[in-house]
């Protein structure tokens, strides 16, 4: 029983070290709170899961709304 518990803890530790898993590995949702007040011109690029570079998260949110899409952020910085 104790061995099984240690094994499970070890497995969980390994999973947490290996980073995001499952659906999260596809990307994260853009934070859209700024978009409600209009996007700024600040250049803080993100790479979308569509392979396009967006100048900032707000612009990605804007396009998701206008195009009724669900593009996620696969990484910070340009694609």
């Amino acid at each position: 029983m104790k061995v099984t518990g240690i094994f499970l803890l070890s497995a969980l530790a390994l999973l947490s070290l290996s980073g995001n898993t499952g659906a999260d590995s596809l990307g994260r949702e853009a934070k859209c709170y700024n978009e409600l007040n209009g996007c700024t011109k600040i250049y803080d690029p993100v790479c979308g899961t569509d392979g396009n570079t967006y100048p900032n998260e707000c612009v990605l949110c804007f396009e998701n709304r206008k195009r009724q899409t669900s593009i996620l952020i696969q990484k910070s910085g340009p694609c």
Epitope: G38, C39, T40, K41, Y43, G48, D50, N52, T53, Y54, P55, C58, V59, F62, E63, R65, K66, R67, Q68
Partner: antibody, heavy 117, light 110 residues
């Protein structure tokens, strides 16, 4: 900040229309550009947009025969519309779609396109 | 399909009077609604955005209100220069849309 359409002119039915919108005072790499038209005696009609990402959207009626492209280096956006008919006779406008206000501003002066045999 | 319906199609108003134009969206568009003034031979002019925010340089005699599906543009103290066609436009989405603009309202000033 301003936008201006290239000269329109007289076209024949089935011809392909190519119009260019030249922008100044802002960058295409961080702005949305839209095309809108107005037929004689009719209202404003949205044609399509090209987004910051390069993605495009078109009105459902325009989708099958319209293409919007851009050249960020030349600060130009091009509208190509195929299979023209007399119903495409209109003044064509390009406009910046302002992401901060969610509105078309500024607009170009417009250019008249006439389709007639 | 986010259709925009404007009423009336045409309205006559005396100088100094008040005119009210209504715009109805077929689906909820929040406050993503703009108003434009368009005169023959000119480029359209942005009057109002986000339903009630006055665009730069626009007279405070123009007032926008509403949210969701029902919107109104009111022009008070109408002047001859206000004779034009006014359009509403939804900015919520372009997906599956025929036209983002309403059909327009012609304002005739007596």
């Amino acid at each position: 900040q301003s936008v201006k359409e290239s000269e329109g002119g007289l076209f024949k039915p089935t011809d392909t229309l190519t119009l260019t919108c030249t922008v100044s005072g802002f960058s295409l790499s961080s702005n949305v550009i839209s095309w809108v038209r107005q037929a004689p005696g009719k209202g404003l009609e949205w044609i399509g947009d090209i987004y910051v990402s390069g993605n495009t959207d078109y009105a459902s009626w325009a989708k099958s025969r319209s293409t919007i492209t851009r050249n960020a280096n030349l600060n130009t956006v091009t509208l190509k519309m195929t299979s023209l008919t007399a119903a495409d006779t209109a003044t064509y406008f390009c406009a910046r779609y302002d992401m901060s206000s969610d509105a078309f501003d500024p607009w170009g002066p417009g250019t008249l396109v006439t389709v007639s045999s | 399909a986010y259709d925009m319906t404007q009423t009336p199609a045409s309205v006559e108003v005396a100088v100094g009077g008040t005119v009210t134009i209504k715009c109805q969206a077929s689906q909820n568009i929040g406050s993503y609604l703009s108003w434009y003034q368009h005169k023959p031979g000119q480029r359209p002019r942005l009057l109002m955005y986000r339903a009630s925010t006055l665009a730069s340089g626009v007279s405070s005699r123009f007032k926008g209100s509403g949210s969701g599906t029902e919107f109104t543009l009111t022009i008070s103290g109408v002047q001859c220069d206000n004779a034009a066609t006014y359009y509403c436009q939804q900015g919520y989405t372009n997906s599956g849309v025929d036209n983002t603009f309403g059909g327009g309202t012609e304002v005739v000033v007596k």
